[in-house]
Interface confidence: medium
């Protein structure tokens, strides 16, 4: 029986019924409930929340809701031996110490188990030495220091400002530069928007606020001790020395009050240009070491955190499909937070909760989706996407055969200006069509569609009259589904105005001040932006699970493949002489893209014309659409990154948060002029072009007529 026969309701009515059932007031209530105490991964509080969500999803009407547990490597500060940084004089006396905790926000003074700021997975150590200021600690910042300024970071403690790139990349870069410790701090230039008060009077970061976060370089591995396989009861675990992605030097985060004390004494070289200056009243000298009067003083780190194998719990809910129960559409977001999780993740978890409630209401009225919908509340995302990755490792065979799509649901807001969507090109048309049907919540756009306000506020840089949609990078739970398994994925949230607000993320990210009140007072008092995000995420899941033909347009992949090929060719053409010397040609890639474009066009024509009442042909066409994303997976993975297997997209090697197109070719070309063996380096470029061209051609052939 089809889902529509089961209810005698038209598909359009079902979608309307689903969307109409979503209520801002419920999201608000759920957010409040999820944010009253900390829910740090591996703690009893987070286990209790998992059980609460399991119970409520069952009440909402899902067919089954199970806990999936894993024993993974986590990291915690030592409760009796706190982490801090000091300035020491020549006698070794500590003349300044950084704060041991953030001053708690009003109303939370008596809350226990607030984890103090720390860099998760930092090794223990007490290095001391001269300080070097390394700006954002990006690849290009170290190039500037080492190549242009001839400053050697070897044996130094580096201080870097948060922002621009994932903190794990900063630590990796510092390690490669020979540093013996890293201090991370939030500069007001990046975390204090002009004209806004600091919390609790506004949404800016106070001087005592600190960003927590993991500093791993997992490259998609999941649990550091069980890469590739689930961390279950009978798992074989690597020794800590063989663990994946752990940093080798101590790392600690601080706020800008403490950073001021370290940076104001800096001597040595002046900053190379204005892009190295933040907003503190300090010279932003690079060092090494302190200036004149303070030249005998050093910086000392005291880090005593421990890595511990700890049990984590995912909640997995199932709403069985009526027609294609073996096809899975997944909506997942994490539950664990650093402290209260007012935005990250509970603004997302509250939206998922309301989406589950709405689907459950329809199910209780006799409706079922065409395909199975899986709902997930992931654990230990903050410790390296561990819950989602372990579950996907455990279920990889099912997922690679049955996974239609994954929609991510972390923070629903990072601002309140306009929509932000990152997704596979297969979902562009789905997102466009859906947002044309939804009302904009934005002031000045009353009665207008979400598509209209989004396009006006965030226009595509390429296509007039269309909104910007970005590439998927990483740093969130879609990673394993998209980058490793090749399941079409997308994410949506409300964002800030990127033109006027240059600060990184939102100011209170991963601090103790990320509370319910932050959201309710300053970001979304009416919860109208949360509701819109619920409609977008929920609407995408609904369409993916219920449309007779999957709402994927392969022609949009053809368009971006051409753009990405143009881009990578243009990068390579910065080296015309070497291209000639080593006979480097992109002809095979452009040819494959041309073939893909033609075959995708023909497939789309067949998709319009085929007999949709023939279930075998329908299933065949849908399978070609479902498996197209899978066809971009190279089983061997990218060089030195075996769990990043998507040939078209991978997280940037220089910033995990950003997506890179044709990453294999891009990395082979990166800084190629500095390679010791140019012949070998250009040989690798040629190999990567070959892999990319083959993959695009092979993917195209999956869309050809089957016989």
């Amino acid at each position: 029986k089809s889902s529509n026969e089961a209810t005698n309701i038209t598909p359009k009515h079902n979608m309307k019924a689903f969307l109409d059932e979503l209520k801002a007031e419920n999201i608000k209530k759920f957010l409040y409930n999820f944010t009253q105490i900390p829910h740090l991964a591996g703690t009893e509080q987070n286990f209790q929340l998992a059980k609460q969500i399991q119970s409520q999803w069952k009440e909402f009407g899902l067919d089954s809701v199970e806990l999936a547990h894993y024993d993974v490597l986590l990291s915690y500060p030592n409760k009796t031996h706190p982490n801090y940084i000091s300035i020491i004089n020549e006698d070794g006396n500590e003349i300044f110490n950084t704060s041991l905790f953030e001053p708690p926000p009003p109303g939370y003074e008596n809350v226990s188990d607030i984890v103090p700021p720390f860099s998760a997975f930092s090794p223990q150590g007490m290095p001391e030495g001269d300080l070097v200021y390394v700006n954002y600690a990006r690849t290009e910042d170290f190039f500037k220091l080492e190549r242009d300024m001839k400053i050697n970071c070897s044996g130094k403690i580096v201080i870097a400002r948060y922002g621009k790139v994932f903190r794990g990349n900063k630590v990796k870069n510092a390690q490669l530069a020979g540093a013996k410790g890293v201090i991370l701090y939030s500069d007001p230039a990046d975390y204090f928007a002009p004209g806004v008060k600091s919390y609790p009077d506004g949404w800016n970061l106070p001087g005592g606020g600190v960003q927590r976060g993991n500093i791993l370089n997992l490259n998609g591995a999941g649990d550091p001790l069980t890469p590739g396989y689930p961390a279950n009861e009978y798992a074989y675990r690597r020794g800590i020395a063989e663990a994946v992605g752990l940093p080798s030097i101590p790392v600690h985060p601080i706020g800008y009050y403490d950073a001021q004390k370290l940076l104001e004494k800096m001597g040595g070289s002046a900053p190379p240009d204005s892009s190295w200056r933040g907003s503190l009243k300090v010279p932003y000298n690079v060092g090494p070491g302190f200036t004149g009067n303070f030249s005998t003083q050093k910086v000392k780190m005291h880090i005593h955190s421990t890595n511990e194998v700890t049990r984590i719990y995912n909640v997995i809910g199932t709403l069985r499909g009526a027609v294609e129960p073996d096809r899975y559409v997944i909506l997942g977001g994490h539950r664990d937070s650093w402290v209260f999780g007012g935005i990250d993740p509970q603004s997302g978890a509250a939206v998922v909760h309301e989406i589950v409630r709405s689907f459950g209401t329809l199910k209780k009225e006799g409706w079922r989706p065409r395909r199975t919908i899986l709902f997930a509340s992931w654990d230990a995302e903050e410790f390296g996407l561990l819950g989602s990755t372990e579950w996907a490792e455990e279920n990889s065979r099912l997922l690679q055969e049955r996974g239609v799509a994954y929609i991510n649901a972390d923070s629903s807001i990072e601002g309140n200006y306009t929509l932000r969507v990152d997704c596979t090109p297969l979902m562009y048309s789905l997102v466009h069509n859906l947002t044309k049907e939804l009302k904009s919540p934005d002031e000045g756009f009353e009665g207008k569609s979400l598509y209209e306000s989004w396009t006006k506020k965030s226009p595509s840089p390429e296509f007039s009259g269309m909104p910007r949609i970005s590439k998927l990078g990483s740093g969130n739970d879609f990673e394993v589904f998209f980058q490793r398994l090749g399941i079409a994925s997308g994410r949506a949230r409300y964002t800030k105005n990127w033109e006027t607000n240059k600060f990184s993320g939102y100011p209170l990210y991963h601090s103790v001040y990320e509370t319910y009140e932050l959201v309710e007072k300053f970001y979304d008092p009416m919860f109208k932006y949360h509701l819109t995000v619920a409609q977008v995420r929920g609407g995408m899941v609904f369409e993916l699970a219920n449309s007779i033909v999957l709402p994927f347009d392969c022609r949009d992949y053809a368009v971006v493949l051409r753009k990405y090929a143009d881009k990578i060719y243009s990068i390579s053409m910065k080296h015309p002489q070497e291209m000639k010397t080593y006979s480097v040609s992109f002809d095979s890639l452009f040819s494959a893209v041309k073939n893909f474009t033609e075959i995708a066009s023909k497939f789309s024509e067949r998709l319009q014309d085929f007999d949709k009442s023939n279930p075998i042909v329908l299933r065949m066409m849908n399978d070609q659409l479902m498996f197209l994303e899978r066809a971009f997976i190279d089983p061997l993975g990218l060089p030195d990154r075996p769990f990043y297997r998507h040939v078209i997209y991978a997280p940037s090697s220089h910033n995990k948060y950003a997506g890179e197109s044709f990453p294999g070719i891009y990395d082979a070309l990166f800084d190629i002029e500095s390679k010791v063996d140019p012949s070998k380096a250009w040989g690798e470029v040629k190999r990567q072009i070959y892999v990319a061209a083959f993959t695009v051609q092979a993917a195209a052939e999956t869309l050809s007529e089957v016989a």
Epitope: K164, R420, P461, E462, R468, S470, K471, T495, W498, E499, D566, K567, I568, S570, I571, A658, G659, S661
Partner: nanobody, 119 residues
Framework: QVQLQESGPGLVKPSQTLSLTCTVS??????????WSWVRQHPGKDLEWIGF???????HYNPSLKSRVIISVDTSKNQFSLKMNSVTAADTAVYYC???????????RGQGTLVTVSS
């Protein structure tokens, strides 16, 4: 750090041609993956996209302005230019040059230059 600076006359007579140049410093204009664009903002209004030139040379214009606008690039000088003919008082605005790309952090804008169309 890439910076953009607009230059050109602040006053243009009606029916004449508005000419602006954007000088890019701190990075190459032929850098792959970027779109070099012109936008304008009328007093009290939203930004209006005029057009852009993609790193591979393709040029796209706002359809409502297409008949009056030419965007060109001079890679040797690391500059790109805007010419808008048959201007009227309705073209009075602050004109900005900008760099854009596929991702959110790619957006950069110059400080803007006020162009008044008046006789």
């Amino acid at each position: 750090q890439v910076q953009l600076q607009e230059s050109g006359p602040g006053l243009v007579k009606p029916s004449q041609t508005l000419s602006l140049t954007c000088t890019v410093s701190g990075g190459s204009i032929s850098n792959s993956g970027y779109y070099w664009s012109w936008v304008r903002q009328h007093p009290g209004k939203d930004l209006e996209w005029i057009g852009f030139i993609y790193y591979n040379g393709s040029i796209h214009y706002n359809p409502s302005l297409k008949s009056r606008v030419i965007i060109s690039v001079d890679t040797s000088k690391n500059q790109f230019s805007l010419k808008m003919n048959s201007v009227t008082a309705a073209d009075t605005a602050v004109y900005y040059c900008a760099r854009d790309g596929d991702d959110y952090g790619d957006y950069l804008r110059g400080q803007g230059t006020l162009v008044t169309v008046s006789s």
